[in-house]
C-alpha cells in the first residue's frame, strides 16, 4: 500500500531571464527512493539515479542544473518555461509518486511564490 | 567490471528472422537504456535503436531502415537485451552491437565483441 | 533523416594537435560523442556528453559542441591514435552516426 505523499513547492512564478528552484520532497514512507525523473509535459529534463547521478537532457544541457538535493534549477528562463513541471519518484517497494508544480514565467518583475500543496 | 557478451548470430536467408542476445554484467542494467549499433564489413556505425530502462517509460526508439521490423526488448530479472529481427534484407548483413547509451558519469563501458548476422541466399 | 558529416580522412605528425570535426544541423543541442576504433576491434567510447572522457581514457583526447559542429581534439597525438574516429549525436528520442574519419598518424 502506498503510504507517501508528495510536497512540491506547488504555483510559482519568476521572472523572464532569471531562474527557479524545482523541489518536491517525499514524506510519510519508509520506501527508498531508486530514482527521480523530472518533466515537462512529455519531455525528459533530468533524471536522478540513486546509484549513478544525474542525467540532463540534452536539449536543456546549457539552463538546467541539478540539486539542490533531488531538486532541479532552471536557468535563463523563457516565457515559453511556462507550464507544468512533473517529479515522478520510483521507490522501493512502493511504486511510482508524482508530484506537480506549475511555473508561470512573467515579462515584468513581479513574481511571487504560490501557496505549497500536497498530492497524495 | 562492465561487460557486455553479444550472441545469436548466424546465416539467414533474406526474408528470415533471427534473435540476437546480448548478456550484461557488471552493473545495474535495469538503469540502463541499451542501443543495438551496427557495422557492416568495412563499413561505419549504424545505430539501430535503443530501449530506455523501466524508470523512464522502457520506450523504443529505431533507425529508419529497421522500423518495422526489428523489435528491441530487455529482461531485467535476467540482465539480458534481445533484438528480434525479422524480414531481414541482405544489407542487414553486419556485425551487431548492444551498447549501454552513455547516460551517467558512473556507467560508461567498453562495447562487446559483436556477433555477425549474414543474410544471403 | 538527421546527418552527421565528418572529413573521410586527417593526418598529423606525432606530438601534434589532431582536430576532427562533426557537423550536423542544431548539433549543439544534441550530445555529441566520439569513438575511436582500431582494426579488427569493437569501437571505444572516448567523449560523451559532449565533453566527458571514461576513466582510461587519456587526457589527450578532449571534445567540444556548439552551434552546428562538434570537435575531438587530440593533444600530442602519438602513434597509437591512429584509428577511425565516428562523432554520434545524442538525444532523447534519436541516436545518428557520423560517416567515421580515418585518422593517420604520420
Known amino acids: 500500500m502506498m503510504t507517501g505523499t508528495i510536497e512540491t513547492t506547488g504555483n510559482i512564478s519568476a521572472e523572464k531571464g532569471g531562474s527557479i528552484i524545482l523541489q518536491c520532497h517525499l514524506s510519510s514512507t519508509t520506501a527508498q527512493v531508486t530514482q527521480v525523473n523530472w518533466e515537462q509535459q512529455d519531455q525528459l529534463l533530468a533524471i536522478c539515479n540513486a546509484d549513478l547521478g544525474w542525467h540532463i537532457s540534452p536539449s536543456f544541457k546549457d539552463r538546467v542544473a541539478p540539486g539542490p538535493g533531488l531538486g532541479l534549477t532552471l536557468q535563463s528562463l523563457t516565457v515559453n518555461d511556462t507550464g507544468e513541471y512533473f517529479c515522478i519518484y520510483h521507490t522501493y517497494p512502493d511504486g511510482t509518486y508524482t508530484g506537480r508544480i506549475f511555473l508561470e514565467v512573467l515579462e515584468s518583475s513581479v513574481a511571487e511564490h504560490g501557496a505549497r500543496f500536497q498530492i497524495p | 567490471e562492465v561487460q557486455l557478451v553479444e550472441s545469436g548470430g548466424g546465416l539467414v536467408k533474406p526474408g528470415g528472422s533471427l534473435r540476437l542476445s546480448c548478456a550484461a554484467s557488471g552493473f545495474t542494467f535495469s538503469y540502463a537504456w541499451m542501443s543495438w549499433v551496427r557495422q557492416a564489413p568495412g563499413k561505419g556505425l549504424e545505430w539501430v535503436g535503443r530501449i530506455k530502462s523501466k524508470t523512464n517509460g522502457g520506450t523504443t526508439d529505431y533507425a529508419a531502415p529497421v522500423k518495422g521490423r526489428f523489435t528491441i526488448s530487455r529482461d531485467d530479472s535476467k540482465d539480458t537485451l534481445y533484438l528480434l529481427m525479422n524480414s531481414l534484407k541482405t544489407e542487414d548483413t553486419a556485425v551487431y552491437y548492444c551498447?549501454?547509451?552513455?547516460?551517467?558519469?558512473?556507467?560508461?563501458?567498453?562495447w562487446g565483441q559483436g556477433t555477425l548476422v549474414t543474410v544471403s541466399s | 533523416s538527421y546527418e552527421l558529416t565528418q572529413p573521410p580522412s586527417v593526418s598529423v605528425s606525432p606530438g601534434q594537435t589532431a582536430s576532427i570535426t562533426c557537423s550536423g544541423d542544431k548539433l549543439g543541442d544534441k550530445y555529441g560523442c566520439w569513438y575511436q576504433q582500431k582494426p579488427g576491434q569493437s569501437p571505444i567510447l572516448v567523449i560523451y556528453q559532449d565533453s566527458k572522457r571514461p576513466s582510461g581514457i587519456p587526457e589527450r583526447f578532449s571534445g567540444s559542441n556548439s552551434g552546428n559542429t562538434a570537435t575531438l581534439t587530440i593533444s600530442g597525438t602519438q602513434a597509437m591514435d591512429e584509428a577511425d574516429y565516428y562523432c554520434?549525436?545524442?538525444?532523447?528520442?534519436?541516436?545518428?552516426f557520423g560517416g567515421g574519419t580515418k585518422l593517420t598518424v604520420l
Open positions: 551498447t549501454i547509451d552513455p547516460l551517467y558519469d558512473l556507467l560508461t563501458g567498453p
Open positions: 554520434q549525436a545524442w538525444d532523447s528520442s534519436t541516436v545518428v
